[in-house]
């Protein structure tokens, strides 16, 4: 007999997801309308292309990047799409309620879709730490809590620290990483006997993960420049991100070879490290004045990423129960911090140059922002982890971790799980 969802989840998931979707439809009906202002079509298309780049990054890039498990590749890709679709809907509403609602209705523009896609991307980064250990009903909870936490964090940072869209969205890297790691810490950790093979990577899924990495690599400049205010800022951000990711690819491949006793290249190292430069320059991508600086940051990020991929998985596996190939959590936590530190260093250099106490105050504000992002990520992550442990969600048994057959119908398989 083929494997099935546990009976209760079969009843719980469709009911939970469809009720939620119906609630979202009602909220959209009562509280939103499209931006009806006249725009020229050419401008609209150009604006839409940025949003399209972000959607490609999310659906294909992050979807496939997490698909390297031998027996969990289908679930990785499809669950990512499910979370993206749900996350974007909730993020549009939440951002609207937090920023526009006093005026009566939430106006939906291409920019709000762009923002929402970036918010949903946060969930796709975080979920890498827990994919394979949770079912879709649990992922719905994770999407709702994380998008809500990130939206509120961004609003608080915007209001208290007076930062622009770009600066407060660039906390997404550390936020998503620490959120995911804290959720993983709450979930049952030990992989029981007999499941060791399931969290290993296989050739074809690893190839699709590499495809995901390539999509992310191609579109990372769009991500880092999407929320910047003027053409000069965007152009600079695109250039610097491109130089940084280009160098981090070279560093990743050569560093991976260097880290192996026989000089072999690790797929896992490469998957993660090719993106390192883009994450590291994220916060400061528009501020870096020359290519060589972006390239140096890409080099440093690539080395940190390879070093992290070599030494951290053992620790993450023991403490958090994160499999070796789930590299995004610790990778983004390190590189996101590096990016934030780079921005703070730029402010410190300003202080040294100007000898000005007020710029020193800006340094403190930036440290405060970063600390707040980490604290909210950890707290909301722990809350989510505790919620996901509730019996109501009928989480997969540990023996069925990292297994597509728990969730998918495979007609060609005669024998069940």
């Amino acid at each position: 007999m083929s494997s099935k969802y546990p009976r209760s989840v079969r009843r719980c998931l469709p009911l939970w997801a469809l009720t939620l979707e119906a609630a979202l439809i009602l909220l959209f009906y009562f509280f939103t309308h499209y931006d009806a202002s006249l725009e020229d079509q050419k401008g609209l298309v150009a604006s839409y292309q940025v949003g399209q780049d972000l959607t490609v990054m999310a659906a294909i890039g992050l979807g496939f990047l997490t698909s390297s498990f031998r027996r969990h590749s289908w679930s990785s890709v499809a669950f990512n799409l499910f979370m993206l679709a749900l996350g974007v809907q909730w993020a549009i509403l939440l951002d609207g309620f937090l920023s526009q609602f006093p005026s009566g209705k939430v106006v939906i523009t291409l920019f709000s879709i762009r923002l929402a896609t970036m918010s949903a991307l946060s969930v796709l980064i975080s979920v890498d730490a827990v994919l394979g250990k949770v079912n879709l009903a649990q992922l719905v909870v994770m999407v709702l809590v994380e998008v809500t936490a990130l939206g509120n964090l961004r609003m608080v940072i915007s209001n208290i620290f007076n930062t622009d869209y770009h600066m407060n969205m660039m906390h997404i890297y550390v936020f998503a990483a620490y959120f995911g790691l804290s959720v993983a810490w709450c979930l049952p950790k030990p992989l029981p006997e007999g499941t060791e093979d399931k969290d290993q990577t296989a050739t074809i899924p690893s190839l699709s993960a590499m495809l995901g990495a390539l999509f992310l690599w191609m579109f990372w400049p769009s991500f880092n420049s999407a929320l910047l205010r003027s053409p000069i800022e965007r152009k600079n951000a695109v250039f610097n991100t491109y130089y940084a990711v280009a160098v981090s690819v070279v560093t990743a491949i050569s560093g991976s070879s260097l880290a192996h006793p026989q000089g072999k290249i690790s797929k896992t190292y490469v998957h993660s490290a090719v993106l390192a430069g883009g994450v590291a320059v994220g916060t400061s991508c528009h501020l870096i004045p020359s290519p060589w600086l972006a390239m140096v940051l890409g080099l440093v990020a690539g080395l940190i990423s390879v070093g992290g991929a070599k030494y951290l998985p053992g620790c993450c596996n023991r403490v958090l129960g994160i499999p070796h190939s789930s590299i995004m959590g610790y990778n983004f936590s390190l590189l996101g911090l590096l990016g934030e530190i780079i921005y703070i260093v730029l402010l410190v250099l300003d202080t040294v140059g100007a000898g000005n106490g007020m710029i020193g105050f800006q340094v403190l504000l930036s440290i405060g922002e970063l600390s707040l992002a980490i604290v909210i990520a950890l707290m909301s992550g722990l809350l989510t982890g505790l919620l996901l442990n509730l019996k109501i969600w009928k989480a997969p048994h540990e023996a069925k971790y990292f297994d597509d057959q728990v969730f998918w119908k495979f007609p060609h398989l005669a024998v069940g799980f």
Partner: antibody
């Protein structure tokens, strides 16, 4: 020459609507953010709304949020302000202004600056019953 | 939301004198987003100083700006007859253009 020309002002009753236009010439309109600023009789300048160079993002002052809509048509080199549910306190001279962006650099970072470097002569909106 | 407070509200000076106008922000702001404008009766405002010490095109060197954090200053070293006008400071962060309430410089 480089200029901004506002039009569409006039006398209107409270609760009614009005649409202002700002025609730009002499520069690449699609490369600049644009703004509406108003000045009530005998009062100071008040920023009303702004729109990014590509039209993707719009900002409003709290006093007009939900009533006014800023938009632009880069193919026509024109910016608009649709004003609905007008109130007596919306009576003012409305200026359109171009957002100039630039930067200076040190060896390690860029410093961006933004200001309104080009203004129209203004169009008067009077809301009165 | 950032609030800009200009002082004094008005200033009575004679031509040739030095004018010092102050602008205080309710919280620390990036100095590169601060600008000063001059407005004469019946005319549109004109950009004077930005970022906070660069002069706009065509602005004479008797106008200078300084400051950082929360305190900014516009200085007119020697007032000329055409300088008597209302001066506004503006913060232009986050694409929102907050103005101060203005300082009127009038002939004594």
């Amino acid at each position: 020459q480089v200029q901004l020309v506002e039009s569409g002002g006039g006398v209107v009753q409270p609760g009614r609507s009005l649409r202002l236009s700002c025609a730009a010439s002499g520069f690449t309109f699609s490369s600049y953010g644009m703004h509406w600023v108003r000045q009530a009789p005998g009062k100071g300048l008040e920023w009303v709304a702004g729109i990014w160079y590509d039209g993707s993002n719009k900002y409003y002052a709290d006093s007009v949020k939900g009533r006014f809509t800023i938009s632009r048509d880069n193919s026509r080199n024109t910016m608009y302000l649709q004003m609905n549910s007008l109130r007596a306190e919306d009576t003012a001279v409305y200026y359109c202004a171009r957002e100039q962006g630039g930067y200076s650099s040190s060896w390690y970072r860029r410093y961006y600056y933004y200001n309104m470097d080009l203004w129209g002569q203004g169009t008067t909106v009077t809301v009165s019953s | 939301e950032i609030v800009l407070t200009q002082s004094p509200g008005s200033l009575s000076l004679s031509p040739g004198e030095r004018a010092t106008l102050s602008c205080r922000a309710s919280q620390s702001v990036s100095s590169s987003y601060l600008a000063w404008y001059q407005q004469k009766p019946g005319q549109a405002p004109r950009l004077l100083i930005y970022g906070p010490s660069s002069r706009a095109t065509g602005i004479p060197d008797r106008f200078s700006g300084s400051g950082s954090g929360t305190d900014f200053t516009l200085t007119i070293s020697r007032l000329e007859p055409e300088d008597f006008a209302v001066y506004y400071c503006q913060h232009f962060g986050n694409s929102r253009g907050t103005f101060g309430q203005g300082t009127k410089v009038e002939i004594r």
